[in-house]
């Protein structure tokens, strides 16, 4: 994901009689004007703000990368939601890209969890039931569940 959020610039509101503790803030979907007097709408499909704020600019909408699908579009109050395409997933420790799911489990392991947009297939040792978190096995390592039947690919 290429998150192009602008730095959330804040400003000090001019000294003036305040009617409430939060006067000088603008609602979600808006940002504050340079002089602090007005609230300006974010531009639909271009930028957004999610909370009451005193940002000088709305935040730029994320564009989904190739290899991602758009689950929901950017509105003035919510950023785009992108998800990895079928057969790929995004790891917490490398959220910048979608990685291909493994097609099967290493020898001596069975698949207990399918490929999802947020996780690889899950494999456990046949006997102990402990999880395996190694690299994708080489093709020849892929086990067959029973003679002549390959382990199910991730759906």
């Amino acid at each position: 994901i290429t998150q192009q959020d602008l730095a959330p610039q804040q400003r000090v509101a001019p000294q003036q009689k305040r009617s409430s503790p939060s006067e000088g803030l603008c609602p979600p979907g808006h940002h504050i004007s340079e002089d602090g007097r007005d609230c300006i709408s974010c531009k639909y499909g271009q930028d957004y703000s999610t909370h009451w704020n005193d940002l000088l600019f709305c935040l730029r909408c994320t564009r989904c990368d190739s290899g991602e699908v758009e689950l929901s579009p950017c509105t003035t109050t919510r950023n785009t939601v992108c998800q990895c395409e079928e057969g790929t997933f995004r790891e917490e420790d490398s959220p910048e890209m979608c990685r291909k799911c493994r097609t099967g489990c290493p020898r001596g392991m069975v698949k207990v969890g399918d490929c999802t947009p947020w996780s690889d297939i899950e494999c456990v040792h046949k006997e102990s039931g402990t999880k395996h978190s190694g690299e994708a096995p080489a093709v020849e390592e892929t086990v067959t569940s029973s003679p002549g039947t390959p382990a199910s690919p991730c759906s």
């Epitope: 503790p21 939060s22 979907g29 007005d38 531009k43």
Partner: antibody, heavy 119, light 107 residues
């Protein structure tokens, strides 16, 4: 269903103040911004200001800033608009209206309160 | 403040006619325009927001278009119940402002 029920018509003398109420029901009071919009007889609509019960944020149209006060009683889900130093040109129907915390359009309106300023 | 100029201010049309009301903003408001219908003695009702998005329950004969400074409300086939005054509103920058209204009647 969503309802915004306003107080009854008022007749006031020039220089006096008026306080109009708007009781909200049918939705979570703290999730929407409530506004006051007025309409002079045979005229267009004029936005006066907002109150957001979620954080007590208030914003006024500069035109009314010195004379209008918007308050709320969260225990009764009621918003009030007080306009002071009334003049004849303040004779109008005063509406409360709500909008989601997002774009500033109004999806539900109260029935309106006629305020007549006459000596 | 942004001025919203509506035209015409009065419009007479026949049932079944295609009716167009225009609204011009004094400066760029992107697509942040809403349209309301107001019947005599009643509060306004939201028809369109973001220039072209129909509000829930609004008949499909009502449509909106435009961006920047020029906006249009169209009724594709006028019905007797459409007799009302129509207002545009910019929700781009506070203070939010309304057009002067277009009173629509049946010929």
């Amino acid at each position: 269903q969503v309802q915004l029920v306003q107080s009854g018509a008022e007749v006031k003398k020039p220089g006096a103040s008026v306080k109009v109420s708007c009781k909200a029901s049918g939705y979570t009071f703290t999730e929407y911004i409530l506004h006051w919009v007025r309409q002079a007889p045979g005229q267009g609509l004029e936005w006066m200001g907002w109150f957001y019960p979620g954080n007590n944020n208030i914003k006024y149209n500069e035109k009314f800033k010195d004379r209008v006060t918007i308050t709320a009683d969260k225990s009764t889900s009621t918003v009030y608009m007080e306009l002071s130093s009334l003049r004849s040109e303040d004779t109008a129907v005063y509406y409360c209206a709500r909008h989601e915390q997002g774009p500033g359009y109004f999806d539900y309106w109260g029935q309106g309160t006629l305020v007549t300023v006459s000596s | 403040d942004i001025q919203m100029t509506q035209s015409p201010s009065f419009l007479s049309a026949s049932v079944g006619d295609r009716v167009t009301i225009t609204c011009k903003a004094s400066q760029d408001v992107n697509t942040a325009v809403a349209w309301y219908q107001q019947k005599p003695g009643k509060a306004p009702k939201l028809l369109i927001y973001w220039a072209s998005t129909r509000h829930t329950g609004v008949p499909s004969r009502f449509s909106g278009s435009g961006s920047g400074t020029d906006f249009t409300l169209t009724i594709s086939s006028l019905q007797p119940e459409d007799v009302a005054t129509y207002y545009c509103q910019q929700h781009y920058i506070t203070p939010w402002t309304f057009g002067g209204g277009t009173k629509l009647e049946i010929k």
